[in-house]
C-alpha cells in the first residue's frame, strides 16, 4: 500500500503545483511598484506581469493592458514567458506519463516497465519545477538588483509581486510531488509487496512428503 499512497500524494501535490504555476504565469503581479517617495503628486501602483501590466490609481481605478508587442518586452520577460509556458506544457505531458505509470491504471502492463514510466513521470515533474524556478529567481534577482541600484529612480523601483510567491510555492509542490512519485516508483520496483493492493492467490506448494496438507481436503 506504501507506494500507492506515495503515488497518489505525489500526483495531488503535482496537480496543485501545476495549477499554481498556471496562475503565476497568468497573473500580472510579478513586479509591483515600491512606494518610497511620499512626494509623488498622484500615488499609483504599477503591476507588471509576463503578458500585461496594470496601473491602479489612487482613486481605485484599475486599468490593465496586454503588451503591445513581444519586441517591446525586455529579454528577461521574453525568456520568462518561454520557460514558464514550457514548464506548464511539460507538466501536462508529465500528468499523462504519470497516469500511464500509475498502479491503478492499465495503460502499461504491471512490472518493471510500468515502474519506469511512473519514475519518468516523477522526473518530468521535478524538471518542471526546476524549469519554472529559473525565470522566478531571475526576475527576483533583477528586482533586487534594480531596487538597490542608486541609478534607478525612486518611482521606478519594484518589489516582488504575489505571482512570484505563488510561483515559488508551485515549484516547491512540483518538486516535492515529483520526488514522491519517484519514491513511489522506486519502492514499487524494489518492494512489490508495498505496491497497490491487487491480491493474487498463489498455488500452494506440496509438503516435503509430496502430499498436500490435509486441511486442503474437504
Amino acid at each position: 500500500m506504501g507506494s500507492a499512497a506515495l503515488e497518489i500524494l505525489g500526483l495531488v501535490l503535482c496537480l496543485v503545483g501545476w495549477g499554481g504555476l498556471i496562475l503565476a504565469c497568468g497573473l500580472p503581479m510579478w513586479q509591483v511598484t515600491a512606494f518610497l517617495d511620499h512626494n509623488i503628486v498622484t500615488a499609483q501602483t504599477t503591476w507588471k506581469g509576463l503578458w500585461m501590466s496594470c496601473v491602479v490609481q489612487s482613486t481605485g481605478h484599475m486599468q490593465c493592458k496586454v503588451y503591445d508587442s513581444v519586441l517591446a518586452l525586455s529579454t528577461e520577460v521574453q525568456a520568462a514567458r518561454a520557460l514558464t509556458v514550457s514548464a506548464v506544457l511539460l507538466a501536462f505531458v508529465a500528468l499523462f506519463v504519470t497516469l500511464a505509470g500509475a498502479q491503478c491504471t492499465t495503460c502499461v502492463a504491471p512490472g518493471p516497465a510500468k515502474a519506469r514510466v511512473a519514475l519518468t513521470g516523477g522526473v518530468l515533474y521535478l524538471f518542471c519545477g526546476l524549469l519554472a524556478l529559473v525565470p522566478l529567481c531571475w526576475f527576483a534577482n533583477i528586482v533586487v538588483r534594480e531596487f538597490y541600484d542608486p541609478m534607478t529612480p525612486v518611482n521606478a523601483r519594484y518589489e516582488f509581486g504575489q505571482a512570484l510567491y505563488i510561483g515559488w510555492a508551485a515549484t516547491a509542490l512540483l518538486m516535492v510531488g515529483g520526488c514522491l512519485l519517484c519514491c513511489g516508483a522506486w519502492v514499487c520496483t524494489g518492494r512489490p509487496d508495498l505496491s497497490f493492493p491487487v491480491k493474487y492467490s498463489a498455488p500452494r506448494r506440496p509438503t516435503a512428503t509430496g502430499d498436500y496438507d490435509k486441511k486442503n481436503y474437504v
Partner: antibody
Framework: QVQLKQSGPGLVQPSQSLSITCTVS????????VHWVRQSPGKGLEWLGV???????DYNGAFKSRLSISKDNSKSQVFFKMNSLQADDTAIYYC????????????WGTGTSVTVSS | DIVMTQSHKFMSTSVGDRVSITCKAS??????VAWYQQKPGQSPTLLIY???TRHTGVPDRFTGSGSGTDYTLTISSVQAEDLALYYC?????????FGAGTKLELR
C-alpha cells in the same frame, strides 16, 4: 534620474548623412527600447523608428531605406544614422525611452536641432 | 498609416477653467492613445497613456478618456504652467503617429 543626452552635428550638407548618439542614464538598454522621433514646423512629430531592448529594430516604412539604428548596451549608447538628407529633413531629432512593453515613448531626450543646408 | 486628427490648432482658456482637447483616429485604436505636453523650447513629456492612465507624477487635474476613434484630454482647472502644446499619439500599431498638436493659450 532617467536621462537621455544627445550629441550630433547642427548642420548637414544636402545628400550627406546624419549621425546622432543618444547616451542614456538611469536605466538599462537591456530592459528598455529607445525610440527616435523628429519634429519639424511643416510635418509636426514624426516617428522614425525604435531599437528594442532585445536588439531588434522597427522602422517607419517611409524612412526604412535610409535609416539605421544600432546600440552598444555596455556604453549605454544608441546610434542613429540617416542617409541622403534633403532640406525637408531639417528638424529637431529626439531619442526617447520606450514605456516597458508598449509603443509609448515616455521620457524624451534633449533633442538635436539639425539644419540641412549647403 | 493611422492618421490622428486634432481639430483645434489653438484653444483659448483662462486660469481655473475646464478645457477639453480632442483627437480623432482614422480607425479604431482601442484605447491605445497617449497624450504629450510640450512647453516652448522643451522636449515633449508624457501625460497619459492607454487613453486614461496618468503617467507617474502627472497631476490629477489631467484626465484622459475615449474609446474607438474619439479621444479627449481634459484639464479640470487650468494652471498657468499648463499653457503649452498638446499632442495625441496612437500606440496601436507601427508606424506610431501623432496629431498635429493643439496650442493652449490664455484668452
Amino acid at each position: 534620474q532617467v536621462q537621455l543626452k544627445q550629441s550630433g552635428p547642427g548642420l548637414v550638407q544636402p545628400s550627406q548623412s546624419l549621425s546622432i548618439t543618444c547616451t542614456v542614464s538611469g536605466f538599462s538598454l537591456i530592459r528598455y527600447g529607445v525610440h527616435w522621433v523628429r519634429q519639424s514646423p511643416g510635418k509636426g512629430l514624426e516617428w522614425l523608428g525604435v531599437k528594442w531592448s532585445g536588439g531588434s529594430t522597427d522602422y517607419n516604412g517611409a524612412f526604412k531605406s535610409r535609416l539605421s539604428i544600432s546600440k552598444d548596451n555596455s556604453k549605454s549608447q544608441v546610434f542613429f544614422k540617416m542617409n541622403s538628407l534633403q532640406a525637408d529633413d531639417t528638424a529637431i531629432y529626439y531619442c526617447a525611452r520606450g514605456l516597458d512593453g508598449y509603443y509609448v515613448p515616455d521620457v524624451w531626450g534633449t533633442g538635436t536641432s539639425v539644419t540641412v543646408s549647403s | 498609416d493611422i492618421v490622428m486628427t486634432q481639430s483645434h490648432k489653438f484653444m483659448s482658456t483662462s486660469v481655473g477653467d475646464r478645457v477639453s482637447i480632442t483627437c480623432k483616429a482614422s480607425q479604431d485604436v482601442s484605447t491605445n492613445v497617449a497624450w504629450y505636453q510640450q512647453k516652448p523650447g522643451q522636449s515633449p513629456t508624457l501625460l497619459i497613456y492607454w487613453a486614461s492612465t496618468r503617467h507617474t507624477g502627472v497631476p490629477d487635474r489631467f484626465t484622459g478618456s475615449g474609446s474607438g476613434t474619439d479621444y479627449t484630454l481634459t484639464i479640470s482647472s487650468v494652471q498657468a504652467e499648463d499653457l503649452a502644446l498638446y499632442y495625441c499619439q496612437q500606440h496601436y500599431s507601427t508606424p506610431l503617429t501623432f496629431g498635429a498638436g493643439t496650442k493652449l493659450e490664455l484668452r
